[in-house]
């Protein structure tokens, strides 16, 4: 596969991953009430996210409440907020770096410098995926640990919410996409024959021998 194709595919995956990460960050479904027992009738389900918690009644009515105080939040929520927002912002920066290093743009002159910029974009996406993975795994670990802890009240036990799964899928896309961008940049530097062909200038007049100047051909 050509470096340009790797670049495009990598960027598409990173953009989808970025969107998924924004969605995971905003959704109030990082943890959901665990239905451990059918003996006790639970008329409502509780969803908890990084920014708000929602109570869904059995009637389907949903009421959400944004967290009032940052200081009142648990350590893992505060850390998850910071790291997830950090990952989203890093992906934003990575997008511009990747576009600047892309072969189809003219922000940076073609050559080793441009390939290095493209490589930096890929690395930033990889870092973004890793950065997002930390709060997702940390949060999931706490939820699972508390679920199996016999000292935790039954109504305070939660299961992993959809946002965590979306987040994991997003980090996978960011890391695969970032990897492809790095591969594309590496291919570009090590195998220039696989990159976009150079822009042709108008051919000069034939020489006396009738040969065209071959410098524009690979």
């Amino acid at each position: 596969m050509g470096s340009a194709a790797l670049e495009i595919l990598g960027l598409v995956l990173c953009l989808v991953g970025w969107g998924g990460l924004i969605l995971a960050c905003g959704l109030p479904m990082w943890q959901v009430t665990a239905f451990l027992d059918h003996n006790i009738v639970t008329a409502q389900t509780t969803w908890k996210g990084l920014w708000m918690s929602c109570v869904v009644q059995s009637t389907g009515h949903m009421q959400c409440k944004v967290y009032d105080s940052v200081l009142a939040l648990s350590t893992e929520v505060q850390a998850a907020r910071a790291l997830t927002v950090g990952a989203v912002l890093l992906a934003f920066v990575a997008l511009f770096v990747t576009l600047a290093g892309a072969q189809c743009t003219t922000c940076v002159a073609p050559g080793p410098a441009k390939a290095r910029v493209a490589l930096t974009g890929g690395v930033l996406y990889l870092l973004c995926g890793l950065l997002a993975l930390v709060p997702l795994c940390w949060f999931a670990n706490i939820v699972v640990r508390e679920f199996y802890d016999p000292s935790v009240p039954v109504s305070q036990k939660y299961e992993l919410g959809a946002a965590l799964y979306i987040g994991w899928a997003a980090t996978a896309l960011l890391m695969v996409g970032g990897g492809l961008l790095c591969c594309g940049a590496w291919v570009c530097t090590s195998r220039p024959d696989l990159s976009f062909p150079v822009k042709y200038s108008a051919p000069r007049r034939p020489t006396a021998t009738g040969d065209y100047d071959k410098k524009n051909y690979v």
Partner: antibody, heavy 116, light 113 residues
Framework: VKVVESGGGLVQPGRSMKLSCAAS????????MAWVRQSPKKGLEWVAS????????YYEDSVKGRFTISRDNAKSTLYLQMNSLRSEDTATYYC??????????WGQGVMVTVSS | DIVMTQSPSFLAVSVGETVTINCKSS????????????LAWYQQKPGQSPKLLIH???TRESGVPDRFIGSGSGTDFTLTISSMQAEDVAIYYC?????????FGAGTKLELK
């Protein structure tokens, strides 16, 4: 295992009071801890619980927003900050070790009287 | 909230007699996952703090004499003292240790006849 409460006494309605509980004989940070109160009127009543590191706290509805349970694992001490006290908060307050949602070791109790 | 109702509230028995204390919960707290009944029994002797006797309806705490027997399931539970001793004079409480708010029964006062 030993838990010893302190800080009780007479207090006027609307005022604050802080109870302490010094624990020994076990690894304090390995256990949930709780406060349970007892009054002739209401009998035994669970007040609040706190998890190992203090990141999770649980309260009985009537004390929610008024009482704050906290712990200092370095000092093996449990606290109960009681604000906006009411006459119905008059009781003997017990500090208890709280594994598996049980109360397996209790202190001797400390009397809190809310009266004008 | 789960309401715990104890009966009788007072009991006077002779040494050697068998004592039965009942506890009824307003709803079942039998865990469908592990089939455990989250009910505990406590003993509070005069002038002392409560002491845990039994948890999970029938599991005795270490050091608790085997004359104390816990039984029952669903919403109906029983604490049986197979042979009353003078040192068993106390108030006995049941408690659901399933979920918050953890609730106690009003107590059964046990005295010697």
């Amino acid at each position: 295992v030993k838990v010893v409460e302190s800080g009780g006494g007479l207090v006027q309605p609307g005022r604050s009071m802080k109870l302490s509980c010094a624990a020994s004989g076990f690894t304090f940070s390995d256990y949930f801890m709780a406060w349970v109160r007892q009054s002739p009127k209401k009998g035994l009543e669970w007040v609040a619980s706190i998890n190992y590191g203090g990141s999770r706290t649980y309260y009985e509805d009537s004390v929610k927003g008024r009482f704050t349970i906290s712990r200092d694992n370095a000092k093996s001490t449990l606290y109960l900050q009681m604000n906006s006290l009411r006459s119905e908060d008059t009781a003997t307050y017990y500090c208890a070790r709280h594994p598996h949602r049980l109360f397996d070791y209790w202190g001797q109790g400390v009397m809190v009287t809310v009266s004008s | 909230d789960i309401v715990m109702t104890q009966s009788p509230s007072f009991l006077a028995v002779s040494v050697g007699e068998t004592v039965t204390i009942n506890c009824k919960s307003s709803q079942s707290f039998l865990s469908s996952g592990n089939q455990e009944n989250y009910l505990a029994w406590y003993q509070q002797k005069p002038g002392q703090s409560p002491k845990l006797l039994i948890h999970l309806a029938s599991t005795r705490e270490s050091g608790v004499p085997d004359r104390f027997i816990g039984s029952g399931s669903g919403t109906d539970f029983t604490l049986t003292i197979s042979s009353m001793q003078a040192e068993d004079v106390a108030i006995y409480y049941c408690q659901q240790h399933y979920d918050i708010p953890y609730t106690f029964g009003a107590g059964t006062k046990l005295e010697l006849k």
